[in-house]
Each structure stands twice: as C-alpha cells, then as structure tokens.
Interface confidence: medium
C-alpha cells in the first residue's frame, strides 16, 4: 500500500494510473466504500463523502490514463485509505495528514517558551525534528518545547515529521519580541548630554503597550522611576517624567531618551521595561551610565568616575603627550602639585580609551580652566 503524507490546510494529489492511455471509467472511494468522485464520460461526478467540495480531479489528465484525486484544505480527519477503482483494478493509497502548530502565538517574548504541537491521525507514530534559525536541533514526539527563547531564535523554524520512512516538512515563522541589546553602557563626561537608545529587534504592523525606566543611581539607596510612557501604533507619548532629571523622549520608534546632562548623582544603571498589549510578561533592557569628572582644588588634581565600571577598567591621569603620571584600577586618581599644562584623565579598557576629560592646569599663580 502506498503511503502519502499531507499537511493540514494544504492540498494533496493522490495518483491513480490505468494501463490504457485513454479516458476510461474510474472511481475514488474511502475505506468505508463511500464514493468520493468518479467520471461519467467526460463529466466529473461526486459522491456523498464528507470531502465533497474539497475533492477534485484533473480532467486534462484523463486522456493519458491518469485519474488523480485532489483533496484541498486538508484536515487531520482526512487521514484514511483511499481506493481508486479503474480497469477492474484497485489501487490503495494511505493518506496521513499532520498538523504542526505553535502554542497560542508565534510572537513570543524573549525568555518565554515555545511549544510546538503535532496533530496526527490515530494509529500513527510519527517522530518530529525541528531546526531553529540558529541551527539548533530539537527532537520529540507529539510536543516539542524550547524554553528561554533567545533573540537568535527569531526566524523560520523547519520541522520534519517522519512516518513510514516518508517525511513532510513544516515551516513556522517565530518572532521573538526583544530589544536588540540586552544591556548597554554609556560613558560621558560631566555636563554632557546623554542619549539612550532602545532599538527593538522586531518589526510589527501595530505596536501598542506601555513602558517605564527605573533608575538605580550609584549614590542612591533605592531605585526611582524616571519616566513612564505609552506606545500606541508605534507613537510614543510620555505619561510622567521626574522633575530631576527631566528626561526627554522621542515620539517615534526606536525608543529614545535624552538626559539633559551627565552628573555624578545620575551615574548608575537603569532598567527599561516594555509591556506589550495582549502579551504576558515584559521586555527588558538594561542601560548603564558612567560619568567622569576632572577637578583641581588647590594643589590637588583629581579625576573620578561614577557608575558601574568593571574591575578591569583603568583610570589614568597624564600630562598631554607624556607617560601616565598615575594609573590605577580604581574609581578615583589624583596628582598632588600637578605641573602646568593640559592634563588628560583617561578611562580605558585593555588599552581602548572609553572616556577622556581634559583639564588645563595653569601655573600656580592662576586658577584652573576647564575647556
């Protein structure tokens, strides 16, 4: 018996060939011997089967002795043995229809689980193997689960259903809703304007929800909500903003925030959350702000940084075009009785300068100038 695998919702063509290459009488029946369709001369006739409107044939092939049964919009319950009667012969074809669906929605938040469920006809024992867009293979039976979805899981999942050495392939498009970056860090000199950007890693026709930026300043004992906003069809509207600092927010995507100026008391880390309409859970992006200040008080030249710096970072004070006078893996460095000239404070990571602030030290009879 020939086995044909079909996909739910698709169209399948079951073949039936006569030895004579001409139009002769044929009938297609199901396992209950109920007539599905056949011919009377050059006319197509349909029987009382439940397939009725979904069953068809190709009259153009009859003259060549081919009498296919076409079933449109396949259903799992269409799985059956179909019999073609032609020239006193019976050709049997076993049709097995499978369906593969994603749980609830194909748009899932980062960190959520994806469950793929296989619908299969009774008596079948298929195996399923799915390949994620990043090449990860998952195997299973009736259900396949992937926990903690990551951004790289966005895209087309290709799933192969294997039954009786035959296979059928499903493609499911999964969109992982996430920010492009899980975390970002901004380095600024004191007084500079700060731009925070929160680009999304997906595009959808309509995007509605609400968000908030909570900020934990390094100097503060508790975190504080800096801004709350609404998102309606990709348009951003601010609901509430703190008075100090007064953040400005762009009206369009990507989400964009401007901090009027970098100050030591603002240095720290924030968490932007975005709750999307009709989704449980929230998207998160961490943002960090490191602020540098260089000052000269009397005979002491000091450079300090505030905010979440890694222990690998090096803070240095050097006179322009000279070797570093002081270099430490600390958040503050200083030079006593600095000589006159343009001093540079540098925050660097493995030789790469992340932040630089210049301060001019005048001869001892004058006061310092900050460029």
């Amino acid at each position: 018996k020939k086995v044909v695998l079909g996909k739910k919702g698709d169209t399948v063509e079951l073949t039936c060939t006569a030895s004579q290459k001409k139009s002769i009488q044929f009938h297609w029946k199901n396992s209950n011997q109920i007539k599905i369709l056949g011919n009377q001369g050059s006319f197509l006739t349909k029987g009382p089967s439940k397939l009725n409107d979904r069953a068809d044939s190709r009259r153009s092939l009859w003259d060549q002795g081919n009498f296919p049964l076409i079933i449109k919009n396949l259903k799992i319950e269409d799985s059956d043995t179909y019999i073609c009667e032609v020239e006193d012969q019976k050709e049997e074809v076993q049709l097995l229809v499978f369906g593969l669906t994603a749980n609830s929605d194909t748009h899932l938040l980062q960190g959520q689980s994806l469950t793929l469920t296989l619908e299969s006809p009774p008596g079948s024992s298929p195996s399923v193997q799915c390949r994620s867009p990043r090449g990860k293979n998952i195997q299973g039976g009736k259900t396949l689960s992937v926990s903690q979805l990551e951004l790289q899981d966005s895209g087309t999942w290709t799933c192969t259903v294997l039954q009786n050495q035959k296979k059928v392939e499903f493609k499911i498009d999964i969109v992982v809703l996430a920010f492009q970056k899980a975390s970002s860090i901004v380095y600024k000199k004191e007084g500079e304007q700060v731009e925070f950007s929160f680009p999304l890693a997906f595009t959808v026709e309509k995007l509605t929800g609400s968000g908030e930026l909570w900020w934990q300043a390094e100097r503060a004992s508790s975190s504080k909500s800096w801004i709350t906003f609404d998102l309606k069809n990709k348009e951003v509207s601010v609901k509430r903003v703190t008075q100090d600092p007064k953040l400005q927010m762009g009206k369009k995507l990507p989400l964009h925030l401007t901090l009027p100026q970098a100050l030591p008391q603002y240095a720290g880390s924030g968490n932007l959350t975005l709750a999307l309409e009709a989704k449980t859970g929230k998207l998160h992006q961490e943002v960090n702000l490191v602020v540098m200040r260089a000052t000269q008080l009397q005979k002491n030249l000091t450079c300090e940084v505030w905010g979440p710096t890694s222990p690998k970072l090096m803070l240095s004070l050097k006179l322009e075009n000279k070797e570093a006078k002081v270099s430490k893996r600390e958040k503050a460095v200083w030079v006593l009785n600095p000589e006159a000239g343009m001093w540079q404070c540098l925050l660097s990571d493995s030789g790469q300068v992340l932040l630089e602030s210049n301060i001019k030290v005048l001869p001892t009879w004058s006061t310092p100038v900050q460029p």
Partner: antibody
C-alpha cells in the same frame, strides 16, 4: 552656604528685551538645575522654566516658550534669563531658584524687579 | 496644566490657635507612593521660603508647628500654634508635572 544673587532692577520700554542674571555660590554649579519664577506685583507665582547648567539644556513653560531664553555660564557660575518683546504684563519680580534635597525650591535669589513702561 | 486651588483666599487666626489652609489639585499628583506637593511661605519684599516638600516632609530649619498632609488631589497645611511671625502669604506648588504650577496664595493674618 548656598547663595543665589540676582542682578539689580531694570526699567524697560515695551518691545525691548531684558536679561536677568543669577550668580550661584556655595555648591557645584553644574550639579543643580536653576529655575526661574515670575511674580507680578501683588500676584501669585508662575514658573517660567529651568536650565541644566552643565549642558545648557533648557525647558520652559509653553506660555513663555517663544520669548524666553535661558543660558548658563559655567566659568562664572551664573545663570541668565532673557525675556524679549516685553509688554506691561511682564512687569514683575523675577526669581531664580534651586531645589534642595527634596522636590521643592529650597534656595531662592532675592528677586529682580523688571518694570516695563513707555 | 495642573490647576491648584487654595482656600480660603485669606484667613485671620488668633495667636496660639490653629491655621488650616487647603490646596486642591486638578488631577492627582501622586506617583509611586509619593505626593509631589510643596508648601511655601512668603513675606512682603522677600522670596518664598520652602516649608514642606513631598506633601508632609518638613524642610530643615522649619519649626515643627508647620505640618503638611494629604495625597492625590487634596492637601492641607496646618500651623499650630500660630505665632505673630507667621503672618504671610502661603502657596502650594506641584512638582509632579511640567509646567510646575502654584496655587493663587492664602494670606494669613494674626489676630
């Protein structure tokens, strides 16, 4: 201690501009926002706007938006508020103010009287 | 803009008695457990003086005779016992949302 000292009284003609200064001392000037508040004679208080001295970013009340310019000079620790196209309605005392540790204005300048008269 | 309505416009209170001034906001000024309402005292020829911030916090150096209460849209400033020196105009001010706004003021007279 924190001090905000404002410039002296001004007499201006309608249509002219006035620039009021506010010199800060006793704290790091760039660390705090400077606000400007108007008080017409015998009237209540009206917020004009604010400036972040470090970056020069300023935000103003829509009522004054087209006529007010707020600036700050870090070298002299001074904030300025300039009001243009003056009318008699602008006759008032103008205050600069700074927040304390809370959300209220804990420090105020002594006020600058601006009189607009032909 | 958030409109703040103070009442009464003026009041006369006997020395040692309680003075109560109310301020009603056109919308709630509460957020995350705090009420963004401040109170000031102003005497003629002087700048305003901060008394209370975040509805009920006493500014340092202000005597405990001054107290603030309320949340949402309704706020109260109490002075008890009233002293001669308390004769002034009192203003409420919201720091919840731009533009920052003040009440129209309440003039306190001591009898």
């Amino acid at each position: 201690q924190v001090q905000l000292v404002q410039s002296g009284p001004e007499l201006k003609k309608p249509g002219a501009s006035v620039k009021v200064s506010c010199k800060a001392s006793g704290y790091t000037f760039t660390d705090y926002v400077i606000h400007w508040v108007k008080q017409a004679t015998g009237q209540g208080l009206e917020w004009i706007g604010e400036i972040y001295p470090g970056s020069g970013s300023a935000y103003s009340n829509a009522k004054f938006k087209d006529r007010v310019t707020m600036t700050a000079d870090k070298s002299s620790n001074t904030a300025y508020m300039e009001l243009s196209s003056l009318t008699s309605d602008d006759t008032a005392v103008y205050f600069c103010a700074r927040r304390g540790n809370g959300t209220g204005f804990a420090y105020w300048g002594q006020g600058t009287l601006v009189t607009v008269s032909s | 803009d958030i409109v703040l309505t103070q009442s009464p416009a003026s009041l006369a209170v006997s020395l040692g008695q309680r003075a109560t001034i109310t301020c009603k906001a056109g919308q709630s000024v509460d957020y995350d457990g705090d009420s963004y309402m401040n109170w000031y005292q102003q005497k003629p020829g002087q700048p305003p003086k901060l008394l209370i911030y975040v509805a009920s916090n006493l500014e340092s150096g202000i005597p405990a005779r001054f107290s603030g209460s309320g949340s949402g849209t309704d706020f109260t400033l109490n002075i008890h016992p009233v002293e001669e020196n308390d004769a002034a105009t009192y203003y409420c001010q919201q720091s919840y949302k731009d533009p920052l706004t003040f009440g129209q003021g309440t003039k306190l007279e001591i009898k």
